[in-house]
């Protein structure tokens, strides 16, 4: 007996799709094989159809797929657009040849039933409305008119002229004539539901003389539509229920047992397992709308269904749509923290992974938000400015070839607290949702600057200090300008190897930023933070005030300020000696390379002029030049 | 909730022919797999047959040990599923439950199914 198990027997109608699901044992091996589904010929050999290993027949192209679910011990064949040539002895299997591991499948497709000459079939979705027609003699006119439903031998009436109602067809059945019409009648049901398939009969009149008239009615279940998710990305459900439920309350719920247990609705209930993860969205007046849930989870997988009603919940005799969502482990999608925590006043850094063939995509940083059917409008992107309330204190950097950029904000408070998504404008399944938590400070910052209070004179030198503990040593420091399109790493000159140091004094880690001579456009945010390569770390930030000299104010001269550089203690010095014929070269912002490099290419006009000032405790004194 | 009621056991000769119906009632919408499971005195509960359908689509699962001998099938309109036992063994006898789940992806042979019939019983014998 073969320790593969799928259906023996799989049925279903032209036109149709199938879904054959085949077990296999679990071991690695087996998770790992190729799997296959091959067509048994006459002659005892089993052509392939469609493989794992990325083979797909003719006769399959653009209507199959084989996908591996190892996490389950399963692999399924889809089939699409059935025609009765399918209809014949199939092996679904692992193993390098047709000769290993398999189950017979027997598949059998049908031609859609066909009924008397005097039977009108009509096939329609659950929850939506149907309209029998009922024709009749002239002799009829003025005769009673009903429509019944066959249960066995006996017609059972569901609706009559005379008023009657069946009370399983309550409010959803009504008979009337269009117009001046004497040949015809009309039943509408609404709301229909499984049990509402059947034969009808409509009749005009009684006895020998009555005109008849046959109708099946087909009620279908949503056929699920079949999604295989990665592990982390996301998925989108488009949900088009139509026109006559455009003015009602729209969910997105998933089944559980008998229940569907509603995610989401337009009236404000959403699912905690979904908070910060979902989005609903109207797509138009029509009823179409959209949900959006990001950071895909393993328990994510299962049978959902989307569907309108003014409760906003699941409700039978209603229109919905039906998807089977499958949440593959094996993902492409790094894993990346999905909290991140700060302290008030403190800076984090998030790292946002996406697809690194799409390096040249947009990339964006937004904040998801509650209210209603959640929103997650952009806070900061590569073409986006900063929005109002973050200037000074977002920024994104992008590590182009990484596959990752970085958002840092900084001057954190508590309402920072929450979650966030990185997306990009390229491949949809890379969004990440980030929750940030912002816990209150109950100890000073790593990095300090001073004075705290800066405010530079134009026309003289100005110089900040940012004070970093012994921790951030081996790091890379930096300052940069913060504008709206970035923070702008300020050009530095190396100041050659570093002494290693033994010993760290705590107090003497300092690295400086000079403007020289301050000019009005130095004014804004300026940063210090550390790095590591790519890897940002700690920001501080500080606004930088420019103002007229006023009169009688004593001129500093460069070289006194230089001095008091000297007496500060012993700093990394990253001074500004930018030589005039390189003011006249223009970075592009969004590149954030290394500060050499920055330095080899030039740099925007009114940076040119900043320097940063780097102190070692190695015994090597900071100067400036 | 949905609630399952099995009949047609009884005592049948080896050779022998039986049909088992099992009527769902209630959320009968919900269902998208029906099976049936027997156990043996003494014995656990073993997976026999299902019946899997979305939309106009159906799969049949048969345990090898059945394969050939029982067939299982579906009235959609009556909410019923029948097992047509033929040439019986005496080691067929067992109780025979009847169960339905929710999920069109769990596997059939498993015994986590939602809902479930009280049994009937079959004996064969001579």
């Known amino acids: 007996q073969s320790p593969i198990f799928g259906p023996q027997d799989v049925s279903s109608i032209e036109g149709n799709s199938v879904s054959i699901t085949c077990y296999y044992p679990d071991t690695s091996v087996n998770r790992h094989t190729r799997k296959y589904w091959c067509r048994q010929g006459a002659n005892g050999y089993c052509a392939t159809l469609i493989s794992s290993n990325g083979y797909l027949s003719k006769e399959y192209s653009g209507r199959a797929s084989l996908i591996n679910f190892p996490e389950n011990s399963t692999f399924v064949i889809n089939i699409a657009h059935l025609t009765q040539e399918d209809t014949g002895s199939y092996k679904c299997g692992l193993g390098t040849t047709n000769r290993g591991l398999f189950f017979d499948v027997s598949l059998e497709v049908s031609q859609v039933p066909e009924f008397p000459n005097d039977t009108h079939v009509y096939t329609k979705d659950i929850g939506r409305t149907v309209t029998i027609e009922c024709r009749f003699k002239e002799g009829n006119a003025h005769s009673k008119k009903s429509l019944c439903k066959k249960r066995g031998e006996a017609c059972e009436v569901v609706i009559d002229s005379t008023e009657y109602v069946d009370p399983s067809y309550k409010d959803r059945a009504i008979l009337f004539m269009k117009g001046t019409s004497r040949d015809i009648f009309y039943v509408n049901i609404s709301h229909l539901i499984p049990s509402d398939a059947g034969l009808y009969v409509c009749q005009a009149g009684e006895g020998p003389s009555a005109d008849k008239n046959n109708a099946d009615l087909q009620v279908l279940e949503p056929e699920p539509e079949l999604l295989y998710k990665d592990l982390r990305s996301s998925v989108t459900f488009e949900c088009d229920l139509g026109r006559e439920v455009a003015n009602d309350a729209k969910y997105l719920c998933r089944k559980n047992k008998e229940t569907c247990d509603v995610i989401i609705n337009t009236l404000g209930k959403r699912d905690p397992a979904f908070e910060g993860r979902i989005l609903l969205t109207p797509r138009d007046d029509n009823g179409r709308f959209s949900v959006l849930i990001t950071g895909l989870r393993k328990e994510d997988a299962g049978h959902y269904q989307c569907g309108a009603h003014s409760s906003g919940l699941p409700q039978e005799g209603w229109p919905v749509q039906a998807w089977q969502l499958f949440v593959n482990e094996e993902s492409t999608i790094p894993n990346s923290r999905s909290v991140v925590k700060g302290v008030t006043g403190g800076s984090v850094a998030i790292v946002c992974p996406y697809n690194p063939k799409e390096s040249s995509s947009l990339k964006y940083w937004c904040h998801w938000e509650a209210d209603e059917n959640g929103r997650c409008p952009v806070l900061v992107g590569t073409q986006a400015l900063v929005q109002e309330g973050y200037e000074g204190r977002l920024a994104l950097f992008d590590q182009p070839g990484s596959g990752a950029y970085t958002v840092i904000l900084n001057q954190l408070t508590t309402q920072d607290s929450g979650f966030y998504w990185c997306l990009t404008d390229g491949d949809s399944r890379w969004r990440t949702t980030i929750e940030l938590q912002v816990a209150e400070a109950t100890k000073k910052p790593d990095l300090e600057v001073t004075p705290q209070n800066a405010t530079a004179v134009i026309g003289e030198t100005f110089t900040i200090s940012c004070h970093y503990p012994c921790k951030f040593y081996s790091q890379e420091k930096y300052w940069c300008k913060w504008s709206n399109d970035g923070c702008h790493i300020l050009p530095s000159h190396d100041e050659g190897a570093r002494q290693s140091s033994v010993s760290c004094d705590q107090s003497s880690q300092i690295v400086s930023m000079t403007l020289n001579p301050v000019k009005k456009e130095d004014e804004g945010w300026y940063w210090c933070g550390v790095k590591e390569g790519q890897v940002y770390g700690e920001t501080t930030a500080i606004y930088v005030a420019v103002e007229e000299r006023t009169r009688g104010s004593p001129h500093i001269n460069p070289t006194d300020a230089n001095a008091r550089a000297k007496d500060a203690p012993e700093e990394e010095a990253m001074e500004s000696s930018v030589r005039e014929d390189e003011n006249k070269a223009n970075l592009d912002p969004r590149l954030f390379a290394d500060e050499r490099e920055i330095q080899n290419a030039g740099d925007q006009a009114q940076e040119n002029r900043a320097s940063g000032n780097a102190g070692s405790a190695g015994g090597q004194s900071g100067s400036s030049k | 909730q949905v609630q399952l009621v099995e009949s047609g056991g009884g005592l049948v000769q080896p050779g022998g022919s039986l049909r088992l119906s099992c009527a769902a009632s209630?959320?009968?919408?919900?269902?998208?797999?029906m099976g049936w499971f027997r156990q043996a005195p003494g014995k656990e509960r073993e997976f026999v047959t299902a019946i899997r359908w979305s939309g106009s689509s159906s799969y049949k699962y048969y345990a090898d040990s059945v394969k050939g001998r029982f067939t299982i099938s579906r009235d959609n309109a009556r909410n019923t599923v029948y097992l047509q036992m033929n040439s019986l063994k005496p080691e067929d006898t067992a109780v025979y439950y009847c169960a339905a789940q929710m999920s069109l992806w769990r596997d059939p042979r498993e015994i986590d199914y939602d809902y479930w019939g009280q049994g009937t019983l079959v004996t064969v014998s001579s």
């Open positions: 209630g959320r009968t919408s919900s269902i998208s797999t």
